[in-house]
Amino acid sequence: RTRSGSQLDGGLVLFSHRGTLDGGFRFRLSDGEHTSPGHFFRVTAQKQVLLSLKGSQTLTVCPGSVQPLSSQTLRASSSAGTDPQLLLYRVVRGPQLGRLFHAQQDSTGEALVNFTQAEVYAGNILYEHEMPPEPFWEAHDTLELQLSSPPARDVAATLAVAVSFEAACPQRPSHLWKNKGLWVPEGQRARITVAALDASNLLASVPSPQRSEHDVLFQVTQFPSRGQLLVSEEPLHAGQPHFLQSQLAAGQLVYAHGGGGTQQDGFHFRAHLQGPAGASVAGPQTSEAFAITVRDVNERPPQPQASVPLRLTRGSRAPISRAQLSVVDPDSAPGEIEYEVQRAPHNGFLSLVGGGLGPVTRFTQADVDSGRLAFVANGSSVAGIFQLSMSDGASPPLPMSLAVDILPSAIEVQLRAPLEVPQALGRSSLSQQQLRVVSDREEPEAAYRLIQGPQYGHLLVGGRPTSAFSQFQIDQGEVVFAFTNSSSSHDHFRVLALARGVNASAVVNVTVRALLHVWAGGPWPQGATLRLDPTVLDAGELANRTDSVPRFRLLEGPRHGRVVRVPRARTEPGGSQLVEQFTQQDLEDGRLGLEVGRPEGRAPGPAGDSLTLELWAQGVPPAVASLDFATEPYNAARPYSVALLSVPEAARTEAGKPESSTPTGEPGPMASSPEPAVAKGGFLSFLEANMFS
């Protein structure tokens, strides 16, 4: 059968596998005139790898909490027993009611895009529900994922997330929207409002058009022992133990303390949804307690003191001191000042010496003062904040926070490239290519101090010399190196970088980028002398910019050959002179030649060589540039892209054509190598390139 190149390139020729895994087909290739000998195209078939998803693909999350994805929720496997590290999930559509993030990475950063099955097994992929402003009973979220592990076909997966107040939540003991308790001065009365007790999330289980006719009924099952509950000034009692959410919302529920001490009080209740006019309705219910704290009227509330963030390296442990947590309270002993963790960060936990290994959620000022309280950092490198509430047991709780900065154990200043200063400008902005600090992550807050300044220039910020600058200023292109002395083609300076309490030093190298156009072209013939002129080296732009004649100094090379000054005419005495310095004018006058030598001590063949030059011009720093070129044995049939001043002796003799040499210094004919006429791209061109050679 015959197939054309265009059919191949158009993807119209298909290979259908049948039988053994190894095989292929024989073919010949013809362009109409020539036919290639037989070729064999080998095909290896791979067993199809199939991905499968197990697990419930549903996640139940407590409102406002963080829940790790587990293997019960999401478990991928492949028929090839692929390593879980290589089973990759891509988040096609992220959650709407919260966010997905990695426990070991910045929980405040961008949304998670990829994660592996191994990370799911490790419990590192977390879903955090964000509390909405409006109450709800149950909310549903979905994540659309794509599971991939080449060469298997991708598999789409949907992870359903149910956020429900029905769930038993250790971090949220109440099933109500709010159950915060009440503080009341001794012998006085206080209104219990929806700021303290609110069951409107039970109402939210009813579709909104019918919601206004529904209510939540609270039945008091255990009355306060040191005071009385009143609804619309009518006392509640065993014979009248009910009040409604609508009465709460209208501010009609009051607790009146009976006086005689400041002991705790409270009441137990059952709450359930009530249909229109008190009819039964299927819906959520809960049994809970409401705490009432009676406050001494002479009590002075504790005053929180300013807090210094705790700083420690990841994976380590550090004691928390009064610098982090302290209060001024003349009425209370340290043991009476209680802290409660309302929300903990993901970078570690608090523990008490002698209090077991696990996290603690309650502790006292005495624990802090005695050094018993410590923070244990996990592997995360993220800063975090503990939201705490602090109370002396006699005043309403006050919110406090404790910031924890995770310090890197070490930082590294990454220098990807030296700073290149354009020759005619003499100045250049530093960027992340020159200075970037990384620890276990990028450190955008890094600060730098110059500990060894440059010899031939200054560092400037805002046009003024500086010895200190920030990563932010670098990223904004505000930090500039400027040459002040035009005598060196390079410079360097040393900086000390500081990020999150850790420092490291680094040397930044500065080089001047020559304003020089270099065209080496195709290979140059060995044994020939070619003309060095502006088609090969051109500093004309530098000449214009500096209003001077640029000078070149040969620093190195060529290894095989030499740069020479050629005589103007046959009459000029002497042969070619060796050159170590020349000017742009010399190049323009065609006075320079490059004698291309043959590599000694090996068989003739292609070779590489180079010239290293230093380029000078008035008022700008010098720059080092190189001219790299390839060489090959002279081929008389080949057109070269440079003017040849002479060709090898042997070639002249063989050819017997004096015109192929131009001893007068006049250029020979110039021709550029033609582009090979090979079809671009496609299977056919691959075959042509590799099989007709």
């Epitope: 619309s232 009609q252 006019a277 008190g278």
Partner: antibody
Framework: QVQLVQSGAEVKKPGASVKVSCKAS????????MHWVRQAPGQGLEWMGW????????NYAQKFQGRVTITADESTSTAYMELSRLRSDDTAVYYC??????????WGQGTLVTVSS | DIVMTQSPDSLAVSLGERATINCKSS????????????LNWYQQKPGQPPKLLIY???TRESGVPDRFSGSGSGTDFTLTISSLQAEDVAVYYC?????????FGQGTKLEIK
Amino acid sequence: QVQLVQSGAEVKKPGASVKVSCKASGYPFTGYYMHWVRQAPGQGLEWMGWINPNSGGTNYAQKFQGRVTITADESTSTAYMELSRLRSDDTAVYYCAKSWVSWFASWGQGTLVTVSS
Amino acid sequence: DIVMTQSPDSLAVSLGERATINCKSSQSVLSSSNNKNYLNWYQQKPGQPPKLLIYWASTRESGVPDRFSGSGSGTDFTLTISSLQAEDVAVYYCQQHFNTPFAFGQGTKLEIK
């Protein structure tokens, strides 16, 4: 002290309408549903419908649908029950009743409506 | 709609004796959301409006003498007066508050024998 005071007795001709009022005091009027229940002479109690004075929402027994209208005036804490197209079998004592949770906790004294040609 | 049926229609009991009135609903009035039976008992004396005695099938209203008690669940309920007093002569009604229409039983007339 919760009190529900109803308007006086009415005598109406068949086909006419009657509007009975019920003035509430001693509690927040808009916080509780008000129901209407009637009792024909020597007969049992028959529930007619309710109003939520807070939302203005109403619900009527199927039997009275289209003939009964229950309204409430928050400014005077008064509920009204209007029954139209009266028939002789509408002769009854009409009660307003304040419901609390899922029961009728307080009742008006009743209004006798007599329908006679 | 839920239909309420009381038995007997009338009852004569001697003073100091126990009186029992039954009430049957055509469907269950037990709520799954709070496990309460939405059944109430009222007492009506001649020329007076009804008075609440028992709610949620067994909870006595504040101020009601403890000789009155209610029992039952689902569809079958009972009002018991443990020791009949002269002032207990009245008509007794059961009523479902499970859903609308909030129906009453036809009533049971209690007299002294």
